[in-house]
C-alpha cells in the first residue's frame, strides 16, 4: 500500500509581502517564508514576528496561517518641551515615510541639533535628515533686553520690565543675585552662596519681577550649588564665581530670559571705557536695599590703574588678579554695592545684538561709589571651560 | 477647563462670503492641530478641513478645495475658516475641533444658512 | 476616500441588554501598531462626544460599558448595560487617510 503527500495550496503573498522560494508546486516538507517591503511589517493577529516560514503538511496543509505585512507605524512624536510637533502628511499621519516638523517657540526659543524635520523609517523611529533618533533641542534664546542699548553713563535708574529679564534676586541669609543662564542654571558669586553650598535648598530663587518685596514672581529652587574649587572664602576673591542649578526649567518669556555667555570676540567689547551695565536690588546711596531693581551704567576701567586703586590699605597686595575687571567713574557716584553681589555686569554685543554677561559683581571699597575706587567683577571670559563643564556634566 | 467657541455663523446668499471664528481657552492652543466638520440638517458629520499646530500644513475635503480656506492666530488662540463662493450644500452646523489623531474636544457650533 | 458603512442604521435595545453597532471600511485603517478608528456619541443638539479612539481604547471620563474591537476593515461597539442615557446617534470615524470620513451613523433608542 503506497499513498501520495497531497501538495499544498500555492501560497498567495500577502498585500506589501512576496514569498520566497517560488516553486511551481510545494509538497511534504517544503517551506516558504515571507518577506515584506521595506517599511512593512510582519504580523500574525497583531503579533509582530521576527521572521515567518510555514511547511507544508502530510495532509496537504501549511503549519501556519498566513500573516500579513502591515505598514510601520512610528507612533504619536514625543512632545518637544518649548516647542510643538506638526503632521506634514496630514493630520496625525505617522506611519512609514510621514513627516513631521518639529519648532520651537517663537521669540524666546531656537532649535538646536537639526532643522526639526523627522521622517517615519522603516525601523519604526522617528529619524531626522542627519539620522537622529532622538528629540531636537528647543534652547533659550539668550540676551534678549527691551534696552537697546546701554548708552551714556547714567547711573541709578529704576529698570523698566523686560530690560533685564536675567535678573534672579537671591534670598537665604543674605540678599544677593544672580542672572539666568539658559533655563535651568543661575550664575552668582561664590561669596553670595558659599554658606548654601552644602544645603542647596535654604535657598529662594526669585525671578521675573522688579520689586524685591513684590508677590508676584517666578519661585525657583536650587538642586545643588557649585562653587569655583579654586575660590577660597575669606581669603580675597580671586575665582568669585558659582554656578547653581535649579531643579526644574523655568518657562522663558519677556520678563525671564537668559543672558548669553560671552563670545570668543566679546572682549573686543570690553576695552577700557566701554560700558556695562549692573543691576541690582543692593545698597542705594540713601544706606538701604532698594525696593525697585536699579541699574547703573558704568565704564570699564584700565586693569593696571584699578590694581593700583586696590594697593594700598587697606587692601592687601595682589587684591586685583587677572580673573577680575573693574567698572566704575574714577570721580564716584556710580557703582554696585552690598545686596547687588552676584549680579551680572552687562555688555551689548553689537553684532548679534545680543547681551552677555562679562562680569559677576564681587567686590569694591568699603563705601559704595568712592572716588579713586571701582567695582570689581569677576571675568566671566576666563571661566567659560568651567562653566561648560559643569553644565554639561550635570 | 478646555473650550472652544464658535461664531460667525448665520444667513449668506448663495455665491457669497462667510468668516468663522473657534477661540480657544484651556489648553496650550499652539500644540494642537485643529479641524472644521460639518453636519446638514438632519444629515450625518463631514470633516471639512484641518490646519497643523503652527500652520505648517493644511489639508481639505475636495468638495471645498478652492473655496474654503483654514487658518489660525496662534497668539489670539483663535481658528479660522474663510468660506467664499458658498452654495446651498454648504448649508450646515460648523464645528471646530481639537487633535492631531482624532477628534478629541469639540465646540457648540455655529450655522451657517445658504440661501437666497 | 473610505468610505465607511455602518450596521445597522437605527436599533432600539432593552435597558439593561447589550447593544452592537458595526463599521466596515472600504479599506484597511490599521498599521502594525495601531487602527485608526473612532467612535462617537452625539445626542440631540449638542456637538458630538468621543467615545473610543484606535478602536478600543476607552476615552477618559466614558462609562465603562463603552468597549470597541476590531482591526483591519472590521470594527465594533459594544454598550453593555445599555442605560436610559444612552440614547443617541453613533457615528464611527477614520482617521487613516485625509479625508477624514465618518460612517453613516446608528441611531440607538432604548425600549
Known amino acids: 500500500y503506497t499513498s501520495t503527500a497531497q501538495p499544498c495550496p500555492y501560497p498567495m503573498a500577502p498585500p506589501n509581502g512576496h514569498v520566497s522560494p517560488v516553486q511551481a508546486k510545494y509538497i511534504l516538507k517544503d517551506s516558504f517564508s515571507i518577506f515584506c517591503e521595506t517599511g512593512y511589517e510582519l504580523l500574525q493577529g497583531h503579533l509582530p514576528l521576527k521572521s515567518f516560514t510555514a511547511v507544508c503538511q502530510k495532509d496537504g496543509s501549511w503549519d501556519r496561517p498566513m500573516p500579513a505585512c502591515s505598514i510601520v507605524d512610528c507612533g504619536p512624536p514625543d512632545d518637544l518641551p518649548s516647542g510643538r510637533v506638526e503632521y506634514i502628511t496630514g493630520p496625525g499621519v505617522t506611519t512609514y515615510k510621514a513627516v513631521i516638523q518639529y519648532s520651537c517657540e517663537e521669540t524666546f526659543y531656537t532649535m538646536k541639533v537639526n532643522d526639526g524635520k523627522y521622517v517615519c523609517e522603516a525601523d519604526g523611529f522617528w529619524t531626522s535628515s542627519k539620522g537622529e533618533k532622538s528629540l531636537p533641542v528647543c534652547e533659550p534664546v539668550c540676551g534678549l533686553s527691551a534696552r537697546t542699548t546701554g548708552g551714556r553713563i547714567y547711573g541709578g535708574q529704576k529698570a523698566k520690565p523686560g530690560d533685564f529679564p536675567w535678573q534672579v534676586l537671591i534670598l537665604g541669609g543674605t540678599t544677593a543675585a544672580g542672572a539666568l543662564l539658559y533655563d535651568n542654571w543661575v550664575l552668582t558669586a561664590a561669596h553670595a552662596v558659599y554658606e548654601q553650598k552644602h544645603d542647596a535648598s535654604a535657598l529662594d530663587i526669585r525671578m521675573g519681577t522688579l520689586k524685591r518685596l513684590s508677590p508676584h514672581y517666578t519661585q525657583a529652587w536650587s538642586e545643588a550649588v557649585f562653587i569655583h574649587e579654586g575660590y577660597t572664602h575669606d581669603a580675597g576673591f580671586d575665582n568669585d564665581i558659582a554656578l547653581i542649578k535649579l531643579n526644574n526649567k523655568v518657562v522663558i518669556n519677556s520678563n525671564i530670559t537668559p543672558i548669553c555667555l560671552p563670545r570668543k570676540e566679546a572682549e573686543s567689547f570690553m576695552r577700557t571705557d566701554d560700558i556695562g551695565t549692573a543691576s541690582g536690588w543692593g545698597l542705594t546711596q540713601r544706606g538701604f536695599l532698594a525696593r525697585n531693581l536699579m541699574y547703573v551704567d558704568i565704564p570699564i576701567v584700565d586693569h593696571q590703574k584699578c590694581t593700583a586703586a586696590y594697593e594700598k590699605p587697606p587692601y592687601p597686595r595682589g587684591s586685583v588678579t587677572a580673573n577680575m575687571l573693574c567698572a566704575g567713574l574714577e570721580s564716584g557716584g556710580k557703582d554696585s554695592c552690598r545686596g547687588d553681589s552676584g549680579g551680572a555686569l552687562v555688555f551689548l554685543d553689537s553684532e548679534t545684538e545680543r547681551w552677555f554677561v562679562g562680569g559677576i559683581v564681587s567686590w569694591g571699597s568699603m563705601n559704595c561709589g568712592e572716588a579713586g575706587q571701582y567695582g570689581v567683577y569677576t571675568k566671566v571670559i576666563n571661566y567659560i571651560p568651567w562653566i561648560e563643564n559643569i553644565i554639561s556634566d550635570f | 477647563d478646555v473650550q472652544l467657541v464658535e461664531s460667525g455663523g448665520g444667513l449668506v446668499q448663495p455665491g457669497g462670503s462667510r468668516k468663522l471664528s473657534c477661540v480657544a481657552s484651556?489648553?496650550?492652543?499652539?500644540?494642537?492641530?485643529m479641524h472644521w466638520v460639518r453636519q446638514a440638517p438632519e444629515k450625518g458629520l463631514e470633516w471639512v478641513a484641518y490646519?497643523?499646530?503652527?500652520?505648517?500644513?493644511?489639508f481639505y475635503v475636495d468638495t471645498v478645495k478652492g473655496r474654503f480656506t483654514i487658518s489660525r492666530d496662534n497668539p489670539k488662540n483663535t481658528l479660522f475658516l474663510q468660506m467664499t463662493s458658498l452654495r446651498s450644500e454648504d448649508t450646515a452646523m460648523y464645528y471646530c475641533a481639537r487633535g492631531d489623531r482624532n477628534f478629541e474636544v469639540w465646540g457648540a457650533g455655529t450655522t451657517v444658512t445658504v440661501s437666497s | 476616500d473610505i468610505v465607511l458603512t455602518q450596521s445597522p442604521a437605527s436599533l432600539a435595545v432593552s435597558l439593561g441588554q447589550r447593544a452592537t453597532i458595526s463599521c466596515r471600511a472600504s479599506q484597511s485603517v490599521s498599521s502594525s501598531r495601531y487602527s485608526y478608528m473612532h467612535w462617537f456619541q452625539q445626542k440631540p443638539g449638542q456637538p458630538p462626544n468621543l467615545l473610543i479612539k484606535h478602536a478600543s481604547n476607552l476615552e477618559s471620563g466614558v462609562p465603562a460599558r463603552f468597549s470597541g474591537s476590531g482591526s483591519g476593515t472590521d470594527f465594533t461597539l459594544n454598550i453593555h448595560p445599555v442605560e436610559e442615557e444612552d440614547t443617541a446617534t453613533y457615528y464611527c470615524q477614520q482617521s487613516w487617510e485625509v479625508p477624514w470620513t465618518f460612517g453613516g451613523g446608528t441611531k440607538l433608542e432604548i425600549k
Open positions: 484651556g489648553f496650550t492652543f499652539s500644540s494642537f492641530g
Open positions: 490646519i497643523s499646530s503652527g500652520s505648517s500644513s493644511s
